[in-house]
Interface confidence: low
């Protein structure tokens, strides 16, 4: 269900590009292409290339991205482009100036002195931002989201963007200083992963992160189940980063039981995160249980 042709504006194109990138990443990491045939991988890569080149049409002179060239650039969308392109770097040829230019813009234009990333031009397609939507802990959630993107681009951009380590540290300082005050499980999970990537989810912060889990297997807020899948996926990535393999199996089991395979309206973030997290699990967890994820690959007809 995941291989689709990206099209539309700078936001819709990323909505379309997301499932294909994450499906290829998942099947690469879990070495499952023989189930589908390597020729399908090639077809999927062509779609990713198409999505990438189409996205360049929405790149502004400042290197940021927006739904339309004449629309003010969005912090969230630019960070999301960085996140998806960073994952796609190993799949197709991506110009590091495009990727690192976006990273530079985020740091230079959108990071405040206290480390917070601000959004001055929210995306039109609010359904694509997942659990960040209507989040009353927006500074923490958005800063964590951007920070995760910056960390995923770090190896690619750290020599082109000299201030990247400092920016990451500053954002981490902000998250760490405010983490104990968080109320929403979603924000605890996303900020927890951002801090875990930096080796800073420790002591009372780690305790808060772990005790926020409902029944030790999910990070859940009232409302949309999609957001809980997304949040729990961030939490799983954090646990894997921490090498907390005791806590991991029930979380994986819960995610697997959701039988969530992506696709559908508003599923962009949940799709990306669940497959990223489960791919990481199958790579990192010793003696991991085989996941019977029903990924079906139907290449779009031309």
């Amino acid at each position: 269900h995941l291989i689709v042709t990206p099209s539309g504006c700078g936001e819709q194109n990323m909505i379309g590009m997301t499932p294909t990138v994450i499906a290829v990443h998942y099947l690469d990491e879990t070495e499952q292409w023989e189930k589908f045939g390597l020729e399908k991988r090639q077809g999927a890569l062509e779609l990713i290339k198409k999505g990438y080149t189409q996205q360049l049409a929405f790149r502004q002179p400042s290197s940021a991205f927006a739904a339309f060239v004449k629309r003010a650039p969005s912090t969230w969308l630019t960070a999301y482009v960085v996140k998806v392109f960073s994952l796609a770097v190993n799949l197709i040829a991506i110009d590091s100036q495009v990727l690192c230019g976006a990273v530079k813009w985020l740091i230079l234009e959108k990071q405040k002195p206290d480390g917070v990333f601000q959004e001055d031009a929210p995306v039109i397609h609010q359904e694509m931002i997942g659990g960040l939507r209507n989040n009353n802990e927006k500074d923490m959630a958005l800063t964590a989201f951007v920070l995760i993107s910056l960390q995923e681009a770090k190896d690619i951009c750290e020599e082109q963007v000299n201030s990247l380590p400092g920016s990451i540290t500053k954002a981490g300082d902000f998250l760490e200083a405010n983490y104990m005050n968080l109320q929403r499980s979603y924000t605890v999970a996303i900020a927890g992963y951002a801090l875990a990537q930096m080796g800073r989810l420790k002591g009372p912060l780690l305790n808060k992160f772990l005790t926020t889990a409902k029944d030790k297997n999910r990070w859940e807020d009232p409302g949309k189940q999609l957001y809980n899948v997304e949040a729990t996926s961030y939490a799983l990535l954090a646990l894997l980063q921490l090498k907390d393999f005791d806590f991991v199996p029930p979380v994986v089991r819960w995610l697997n039981e959701q039988r969530y395979y992506g696709g559908g309206y508003g599923s962009t973030q949940a799709t990306f995160m669940v497959f990223q997290a489960l791919a990481q699990y199958q790579k990192d967890a010793p003696d991991h249980q085989e996941l019977n994820l029903d990924v079906s690959l139907q290449l779009p007809s031309r």
């Epitope: 100036q97 750290e158 020599e159 201030s163 380590p165 540290t169």
Partner: antibody, heavy 119, light 107 residues
């Protein structure tokens, strides 16, 4: 306070190599990037390259790719620049400088190391 | 590589005067420009980053301006410690080249 302490002046023969060091203190070495800059007597500044001490990743000015090799030793918080096949054109003061803040610029500089190539 | 051109190459001015130094990039570098001052026999020191952000401890008589390809450094009411050679440097794609320098001397 961040400090970069460079090694002392060097007088070397043409055709040989020299290794200049830059010891960092007052910060977490692996969170900074170290850059190297050349200044010939009475001339301007030339950017040689950058190293990320955390990963060992480097980026060079094409002009210096063959001439300079940048390395770093995390355990001693020291960055090094080796210059090879020295000629009189390499006689210069070499500076190391580091980044941390969001400045996109060299916040902190070493005092410079004078390298003189002479037979 | 991006070329950085500074003008003038040298100028002389008196204490208390106001001077402006220009720097031109061969292509759009957005705001990725820094200014440094180097005094005789010393290391350069950062004055301005991101085209207009003053570095810590730099007096407010210094101000940076411009974006894209044209940049300037203005010094109001020159002080004796302001004399030396000023360099601009871009940070938009490797190599991070410097301008040729502007030597500011006391009249």
């Amino acid at each position: 306070q961040v400090q970069l302490q460079q090694s002392g002046a060097e007088l070397v023969r043409p055709g040989t190599s020299v290794k200049v060091s830059c010891k960092a203190s007052g910060h977490s070495f692996t969170n900074y990037l170290i850059e190297w800059v050349k200044q010939r007597p009475g001339q301007g500044l030339e950017w040689i390259g950058v190293i990320n001490p955390g990963s060992g990743g480097t980026n060079y000015n094409e002009k210096f790719k063959v001439k300079a090799t940048l390395t770093a030793d995390k355990s001693s918080s020291t960055a090094y620049m080796q210059l090879s096949s020295l000629t009189s054109e390499d006689s210069a003061v070499y500076f190391c400088a580091s980044y941390y803040s969001n400045s996109y610029a060299m916040d902190y500089w070493g005092q410079g190391t004078s390298v003189t190539v002479s037979s | 590589d991006i070329q950085m051109t500074q003008s003038p190459a040298s100028l002389s001015a008196s204490v208390g005067e106001t001077v402006t130094i220009a720097c031109r990039a061969s292509e759009n570098i957005y705001s990725y420009l820094a200014w440094y001052l180097q005094k005789e026999g010393k290391s350069p020191q950062l004055l301005v980053s991101k085209a207009k952000t003053l570095a810590d401890g730099v007096p407010s008589r210094f101000s940076g301006g411009g974006s894209g390809t044209q940049f300037s450094l203005k010094i109001n009411s020159l002080q004796p410690e302001d004399f030396g050679t000023f360099y601009c440097q871009h940070h938009y794609g490797i190599p991070y080249t410097f301008g040729g320098g502007t030597k500011l001397e006391i009249k």
